[in-house]
């Protein structure tokens, strides 16, 4: 058993049929010695008396808010949550496996630049009685600070018969160093509590590996005289790291016909302009990627050819 | 800023070669990008590589003050990786494919380090750790880790040279 926060405790249980469970001793936080009784949740049934209560925790029915009283007055509370371990593996019932970029990916994180700011998100089908708490650091043995905000519900989607809820959190490294080569990964830890079930999820990454620039901005076309060619120009996204002479991007320019089956013409360039042939009813799209490190491409910025 | 005993590098040449190094480092093992090698334990094997740290002067302001400080660290790293790529980690079994970019990568590391250290100058270089994995699978894992680390190192070096070529070239 360990303390998650004040008056909230997590009992770690091996979860199998007829498992013996864990013996837990609760102590009433009071100077009083006599006349103390214990109850669980809203029930008025007295579970025991005395300053301590010893219980055998085996299942969710044994978890909940234990309260010690004296003469009708509440003295203190202890909330017991369960963390299940099945076949040596901690349960992952609360969050959905996003399966990208690999199986057992529950947390996904992205950064728009090298400033040390990043966003993580996760999915669940659970809509109520759900709380999340997020902690992060750079490295684990001698951790350096990363500050995370509160996790918020950021999207709701209908998937078949189910509703899916996306939660996200923003974090910022306290002493970020955009120009350095990272040697210690960022660690993100999410505590999830659904009713009386506790689970924790972790992710470890370098900012450089989760970079995904915003799409290029101000995408414009300029027809070239007496030609089917156009000059496409664009700018670095506002959110990208500066100076751009140091934090450079590379770009992919694509000409795509109306039909998905039509052949796509692609040009790669380090410049912020390119000359392409604009076909009727086609569109021109540009996306960006870090020039020197193969992290994710941005989403496309697009304009119609006409 | 004039540097006693140090001269300005050929920024544009360094930029071109470092960008080529980036391309080669990713083509040497593109899949490396999708493997989470941190899960494989064995951290100490690549812990000794010289990283370009926050205080090394490789940020735009540090480069403007005196680029030699950053260039020393980059040179140290290039020599380190050049030695690793020439060691039995890469030359031993399992053999690299004949068209593997590792050979080109090795030569380009040497080429860039020579651009930074003209003939006659001999800078102290970091000792490479004695890594001699006994099993071919260990060697393979170590190759992936070294290439992964090299990708990060050359990305920072390429940024430095691109910025130098754009802002510090005479």
């Amino acid at each position: 058993i360990w303390e998650l926060k004040k008056d909230v405790y997590v009992v770690e249980l091996d979860w199998y049929p007829d498992a013996p469970g864990e013996m837990v001793v609760l102590t009433c936080d009071t100077p009083e010695e006599d006349g103390i009784t214990w109850t669980l949740d809203q029930s008025s049934e007295v579970l025991g008396s005395g300053k301590t209560l010893t219980i055998q925790v085996k299942e969710f029915g044994d978890a909940g808010q234990y309260t010690c009283h004296k003469g009708g007055e509440v003295l203190s509370h202890s909330l017991l949550l369960l963390h299940k371990k099945e076949d040596g593996i901690w349960s992952t019932d609360i969050l959905k496996d996003q399966k990208e970029p690999k199986n057992k990916t529950f947390l996904r994180c992205e950064a728009k630049n090298y400033s040390g700011r990043f966003t993580c998100w996760w999915l669940t089908t659970i809509s109520t009685d759900l709380t999340f708490s997020v902690k992060s650091s750079r490295g684990s043995s001698d951790p350096q600070g990363v500050t995370c905000g509160a996790a918020t519900l950021s999207a709701e989607r209908v998937r078949g018969d189910n509703k899916e809820y996306e939660y996200s959190v923003e974090c910022q490294e306290d002493s970020a160093c955009p120009a350095a080569e990272e040697s210690l990964p960022i660690e993100v830890m999410v505590d999830a509590v659904h009713k009386l079930k506790y689970e924790n999820y972790t992710s470890s990454f370098f900012i450089r590996d989760i970079i995904k620039p915003d799409p290029p901005k101000n995408l414009q076309l300029k027809p070239l005289k007496n030609s089917r060619q156009v000059e496409v120009s664009w700018e670095y996204p506002d959110t990208w790291s500066t100076p751009h002479s140091y934090f450079s991007l590379t770009f992919c320019v694509q000409v795509q016909g109306k039909s998905k089956r039509e052949k796509k013409d692609r040009v790669f360039t380090d410049k912020t302009s390119a000359t392409v042939i604009c076909r009727k009813n086609a569109s021109i799209s540009v996306r960006a990627q870090d020039r020197y490190y193969s992290s994710s491409w941005s989403e496309w910025a697009s304009v119609p050819c006409s | 800023r004039a540097v006693p005993g140090g001269s300005s590098p050929a920024w544009t040449q360094c930029q071109q070669l470092s960008q080529k190094l980036c391309t080669l480092a990713w083509s040497a093992h593109p899949l490396v990008g999708h493997m989470d090698l941190r899960e494989e334990g064995d951290e100490e094997t690549t812990n000794d590589v010289p990283h370009i740290q926050c205080g090394d002067g490789c940020d735009p302001q540090g480069l403007r003050d005196n680029s030699q400080f950053c260039l020393q660290r980059i040179h140290q790293g290039l020599i380190f990786y050049e030695k690793l790529l020439g060691s039995d980690i890469f030359t031993g079994e399992p053999s690299l494919l004949p068209d593997s970019p590792v050979g080109q990568l090795h030569a380009s590391l040497l080429g860039l380090s020579q651009l930074l250290q003209p003939e006659g100058h001999h800078w102290e270089t970091q000792q490479i750790p004695s890594l001699s994995p006994s099993q071919p699978w260990q060697r393979l894992l170590l190759r992936f880790k070294i290439l992964r680390s090299l990708q990060a190192f050359v990305a920072v070096a390429a940024r430095v040279f691109a910025h130098g070529a754009a802002t510090l070239s005479p």
Epitope: - | P4, Q53, C54, G55, D56, D65, Q68, F69, R73
Partner: nanobody, 124 residues
Framework: EVQLVESGGGLVQAGTSLRLSCAAS????????MGWFRQAPGKEREFVAI????????DYRDSVKGRFTISRDNARNTGYLEMNSLKPEDTAVYFC?????????????????WGQGTQVTVSS
């Protein structure tokens, strides 16, 4: 954490020499750029000299160029500041420091690890 201890300060006549030492313990000294700074009474702490982690490149404030020499011995985890032709205006507490942050190479704010300082007084 890194601990730095300076020594070698003292009271000397103008025109003479002193050699300051900076002994490091804790983290790997040889990983960091090292700098010497000084602070005269009632004045800001100012940059004196700086040296790369491998000891190859150095830089100095204009007023000490040609008189002061910074060096380091990574095998001994020690840095040095050789001060020749000392002048009364060199009087200050001298600090050694290791650089851990980005920004100007000459900004004390980019150095996180500091010694307690050693007093140098140059009389005319």
């Amino acid at each position: 954490e890194v601990q730095l201890v300076e020594s070698g300060g003292g009271l000397v006549q103008a025109g003479t020499s002193l050699r300051l030492s900076c002994a490091a313990s804790g983290r790997t000294f040889s990983n960091y750029i090292m700098g010497w700074f000084r602070q005269a009474p009632g004045k800001e702490r100012e940059f004196v000299a700086i040296i790369t982690a491998n000891g190859v490149a150095t830089d100095y404030r204009d007023s000490v160029k040609g008189r002061f020499t910074i060096s380091r011995d990574n095998a001994r985890n020690t840095g040095y500041l050789e001060m020749n032709s000392l002048k009364p205006e060199d009087t200050a507490v001298y600090f050694c420091a290791l650089r851990t942050r980005s920004g100007s190479l000459f900004d004390p704010g980019t150095f996180d690890y500091w010694g307690q300082g050693t007093q140098v007084t140059v009389s005319s």
